[in-house]
Amino acid sequence: MSSKYPRSVRRCLPLCALTLEAALILLFYFFTHYDASLEDQKGLVASYQVGQDLTVMAALGLGFLTSNFRRHSWSSVAFNLFMLALGVQWAILLDGFLSQFPPGKVVITLFSIRLATMSAMSVLISAGAVLGKVNLAQLVVMVLVEVTALGTLRMVISNIFNTDYHMNLRHFYVFAAYFGLTVAWCLPKPLPKGTEDNDQRATIPSLSAMLGALFLWMFWPSVNSALLRSPIQRKNAMFNTYYALAVSVVTAISGSSLAHPQRKISMTYVHSAVLAGGVAVGTSCHLIPSPWLAMVLGLVAGLISIGGAKCLPVCCNRVLGIHHISVMHSIFSLLGLLGEITYIVLLVLHTVWNGNGMIGFQVLLSIGELSLAIVIALTSGLLTGLLLNLKIWKAPHVAKYFDDQVFWKFPHLAVGF
């Protein structure tokens, strides 16, 4: 059976991707060099391990998390890896150019790779809203635009609010969620009869999605502490994330059962909700003074995600006209906001406890940063969505949504596939 992928795209995609890669290699040749400073071998290993954790989260965690479609699991995992690989390269260059003025040579360190991986992860989160509805050429465009938009957001925030360019990555959950939702909103909406089959989850893909959730669950403390310098803050971030995740697992499984008329557990809800705590404490994990607070946040996040898993897809479909966005993705948008609000509340409490007169200023600053993140996410998401709708990309027909056969060569086409 021949591929339904338009021939023009099949011909030009490899060429375009390789040309883009060649261009990146040239940019690396002219504008980058390795960090020449000396680092103790033990320190190097410790620093590398954090980056390794982030890569596992991005490649395995987010890769498998989105593989919960019966006919789209290959594409989910492989396209995710493709986006990650491309995103990291572009993010390293962009971060290097944007974080120094006047622009000079970009120094590549383990830390810059860590930052780039986090920037690329935002694309993977956003892609959760569009995977299955777009082809690889469109995803390439999405990677380049979103990494650039996130870099621009951080640049704008650092110039307006005088905060460190890299520190602004803390908004990446919210940015990624709203960017993805906006892009999905722009894509062709109706799902014709007969393709619901592709949209159904099957046991094996749901298990692989759960595997992805487990990878994310194990390494989430790393992503929440990856950018912090202070050992105490890093430790707080790790512990608080761990406790919040632990509680959200218990909440997810029991809440999923409660939400079902026959008290049965839904795997779809579970693999989304188990991660709720990690997202909810993401922005404020270094500020949380004791475990119980993190646990409460994990509980609230778990409940929100179970409620969201039931209501949000329906809401997105009917109100926004966005058909199928991954449950995890819709939850990111809610929990990202919960995390940001928690951060602002904790900021107020800290400044009150410490008798700091800067309270109003601090809160305004945080609200300003959050608002800017959402505005830029929506704007750049809208532009990307409109760009992806152009005919030149030869987007998959709506009848071919969530179908691996459009993109992949199968050794044998078993009837049950």
């Epitope: 520190m167 050992p231 105490i232 400044t351």
Partner: antibody, heavy 128, light 107 residues
Framework: EVQLLESGPGLGKPSETLSLTCGVS????????WSWIRQSPGKGLEWIGE????????HYNPSLKGRVTISKDASKNQLSLRLTSVTAADTAVYYC?????????????????????WGRGLVVTVSS | ELQMTQSPSALSASVGDRVTISCRAS??????LAWYQQKPGKAPKLLIY???RLQSGIPSRFSASGAGTEFTLTISGLQPEDSAVYYC?????????FGPGTKLDIK
């Protein structure tokens, strides 16, 4: 309250290796970043390098051209500075200091904060 | 490597006066700057971190502002014990460079 005390030989000969230690009390070294700074007679302050008390991550001043090594011993709650191939230009008061941290102003893994606690300093003279 | 400059290199003022010391970075360091006070024969003492945040235990007559490349330390209502050398330090990228210092004398 945290207290830092530098110790080591006050006198060294050119081309020798200088080894200083900094004993810390009142705080666990694994909770902070620690720096070594020196001040030549009548001159300003020069940052030598730093170590993360919770990992083995270190950063050094490139002007010292790889002659410096900072290490820690968590069991003794102390830090060490090793400077090889010393010359008369290394004559200075050597300080160890702790980096402060404010949860409201979290700093990035590559940026620091102010040094909020300092030792009294150790006078080191290098001469033949 | 980042360069830090301070001005003036020395100044003299009377008790009760308001003095301002400037510090300039050769490139953008956001708010990653600290100010120290050093008295003769003593170790430096942290006054300000994060460009404008007052270290606990430091009198409120010390204040600071600035971001990017231009920073200032202001001492209002000068006291005799404020006679010292004041240093700024960038803590944006290592090596964390100190400024050359400003010597403040009380008349």
């Amino acid at each position: 309250e945290v207290q830092l005390l530098e110790s080591g030989p006050g006198l060294g000969k050119p081309s020798e290796t200088l080894s200083l230690t900094c004993g810390v009390s009142g705080a666990s070294i694994s909770n902070y970043w620690w720096s070594w700074i020196r001040q030549s007679p009548g001159k300003g302050l020069e940052w030598i390098g730093e170590i993360d008390g919770s990992t083995y991550s270190t950063h050094y001043n490139p002007s010292l051209k790889g002659r410096v090594t900072i290490s820690k011993d968590a069991s003794k709650n102390q830090l060490s500075l090793r400077l090889t191939s010393v010359t008369a230009a290394d004559t200075a008061v050597y300080y160890c200091a702790r980096e402060g941290q404010d949860p409201l102003a979290p700093t990035l893994a590559t940026s620091g904060s102010g040094l909020d606690s300092w030792g009294r300093g150790l006078v080191v003279t290098v001469s033949s | 490597e980042l360069q830090m400059t301070q001005s003036p290199s020395a100044l003299s003022a009377s008790v009760g006066d308001r003095v301002t010391i400037s510090c300039r970075a050769s490139q953008d360091i956001y708010s990653n700057l600290a100010w120290y006070q050093q008295k003769p024969g003593k170790a430096p003492k942290l006054l300000i971190y994060g460009a404008s945040r007052l270290q606990s235990g430091i009198p409120s007559r010390f204040s600071a502002s600035g971001a990017g490349t231009e920073f200032t330390l202001t001492i209002s209502g000068l006291q005799p014990e404020d006679s010292a050398v004041y240093y700024c330090q960038e803590v944006h990228r290592n090596p964390f460079t100190f400024g050359p210092g400003t010597k403040l004398d009380i008349k």
